[in-house]
């Protein structure tokens, strides 16, 4: 028969024949032959391979270096890498989480739209009309201006995106 030019899923073409890939958690020792199956070997302690593969070596689990602000979020297995995350107040700089940076603070005039996590930074938004933020914070949302009317007071100084309104007593005309 004609040698194959393509193979099924979870197979690969080698020496004019289709061989089975090694399952996750195992590495390739030798290709299949006309008479033998693909030979695979389990990954060692602290090693992994996460896909059907023909890798000749397993990869070491990632080290979550505390000197870089990293800690283990999920311990690796023979089929998964260790997942790192960042210490409180910090977040990863990439999906692979190789290093951490301090959460961004939202400047006065901006409030926190979404609080940062171990893998995403703070998302800030400008305070809309009727709201303000007078601090630089990684947690504070924009606050609504004080309602002078509900306190039976009047606005003496208008609010901005960075300052609250200033309320004062109403001028009462004597009869």
């Amino acid at each position: 028969p004609e040698p194959p030019t393509a193979c099924r899923e979870k197979q690969y073409l080698i020496n004019s024949q289709c061989c089975s890939l090694c399952q996750p958690g195992q590495k390739l020792v030798s290709d299949c032959t006309e008479f033998t199956e693909t030979e695979c070997l389990p990954c060692g302690e602290s090693e992994f391979l996460d896909t059907w593969n023909r890798e000749t070596h397993c990869h070491q689990h990632k080290y979550c270096d505390p000197n870089l602000g990293l800690r283990v979020q999920q311990k690796g297995t023979s089929e998964t890498d260790t997942i790192c995350t960042c210490e409180e107040g910090w977040h990863c700089t990439s999906e692979a989480c190789e290093s951490c940076v301090l959460h961004r603070s939202c400047s006065p005039g901006f409030g926190v739209k979404q609080i940062a996590t171990g893998v995403s930074d703070t998302i800030c938004e400008p305070c809309p009309v009727g709201f303000f933020s007078n601090v630089s914070s990684a947690f504070e949302k924009c606050h609504p201006w004080t309602s002078c009317e509900t306190k039976d007071l009047v606005v003496q100084q208008a609010g901005t995106n960075k300052t609250d309104v200033v309320c004062g007593p109403q001028d009462r005309l004597r009869a």
Epitope: Y12, N15, T56, H57, D81, E95, A96
Partner: antibody, heavy 120, light 107 residues
Framework: QVQLVQSGGGLVQPGGSLRLSCAAS????????MSWVRQAPGKGLEWVST????????YYTDSVKGRFTTSRDNPKNTLFLQMSSLRAEDTAVYYC?????????????WGQGTLVTVSS | EIVLTQSPATLSLSPGERATLSCRAS??????LAWYQQKPGQAPRLLIY???NRATGIPARFSGSGSGTDFTLTISSLEPEDFAVYYC?????????FGQGTKVEIK
């Protein structure tokens, strides 16, 4: 057909940063291990970095560890190399390369290459 | 890491001649060796993988052999487009490494 189209090279001062991109098409990007290989002017090929299909696991040659970051955007079929604290010895043509089915190497498809020159 | 040493550094031959390029590994790479061709101003191109398997679209005049530490790329009859630099690369151990290259030039 498989294509890897690179962008983002150029001249940068020592200590500077640069981001290279590699747009992939013609194959299921997330199923393949991707790598960066560089070639200094008049020199041979040197493996720089590898990222597994998930994007969670990355590997680097010792000389770029802590300075280069490889990432991928699987929905957009794009590979990235963020280079910082660049040195004169990082001057090279950088290639993105795709691993064969089930393996990191050999590299069966390569980008066209992009020149990074680190000089003051 | 595994060091690959290619010889000769330069091979001067005429079209139609047979080219024999050598790649020696500092330790066994079993059969996990590949060969690439690179022309000036171009990206490398995979020729041979796992010692002797031709990549898609590679002509039959290119063949690979060897095992363990000693490998050979043979071009049975050189065509004008074959004059280029050739690199070997191993994947037996991490990290992947390349030889320094052999330049095949026109005599």
């Amino acid at each position: 057909q498989v294509q890897l189209v690179q962008s983002g090279g150029g001249l940068v001062q020592p200590g500077g940063s640069l981001r290279l991109s590699c747009a992939a098409s013609g194959f299921t990007f997330s199923n393949y291990v991707m790598s960066w290989v560089r070639q200094a002017p008049g020199k041979g090929l040197e493996w720089v970095s590898t990222i597994r299909g998930s994007g969670i696991s990355t590997y680097y040659t010792d000389s770029v560890k802590g300075r280069f970051t490889t990432s991928r955007d699987n929905p957009k079929n794009t590979l990235f190399l963020q280079m910082s604290s660049l040195r004169a010895e990082d001057t090279a043509v950088y290639y993105c390369a795709k691993g064969i089915v089930g393996a990191t190497t050999p590299f069966d498809y390569w980008g066209q290459g992009t020149l990074v020159t680190v000089s003051s | 890491e595994i060091v690959l040493t290619q010889s000769p550094a330069t091979l001067s031959l005429s079209p139609g001649e047979r080219a024999t390029l050598s790649c020696r590994a500092s330790q066994s790479v079993r059969s996990f060796l590949a060969w690439y061709q690179q022309k000036p101003g171009q990206a490398p191109r995979l020729l041979i993988y796992e010692t002797s398997n031709r990549a898609t679209g590679i002509p039959a005049r290119f063949s690979g052999s060897g095992s363990g530490t000693d490998f050979t790329l043979t071009i049975s009859s050189l065509e004008p487009e074959d004059f280029a630099v050739y690199y070997c690369q191993q994947r037996s151990d991490w990290p992947p490494t390349f030889g320094q290259g052999t330049k095949v030039e026109i005599k």
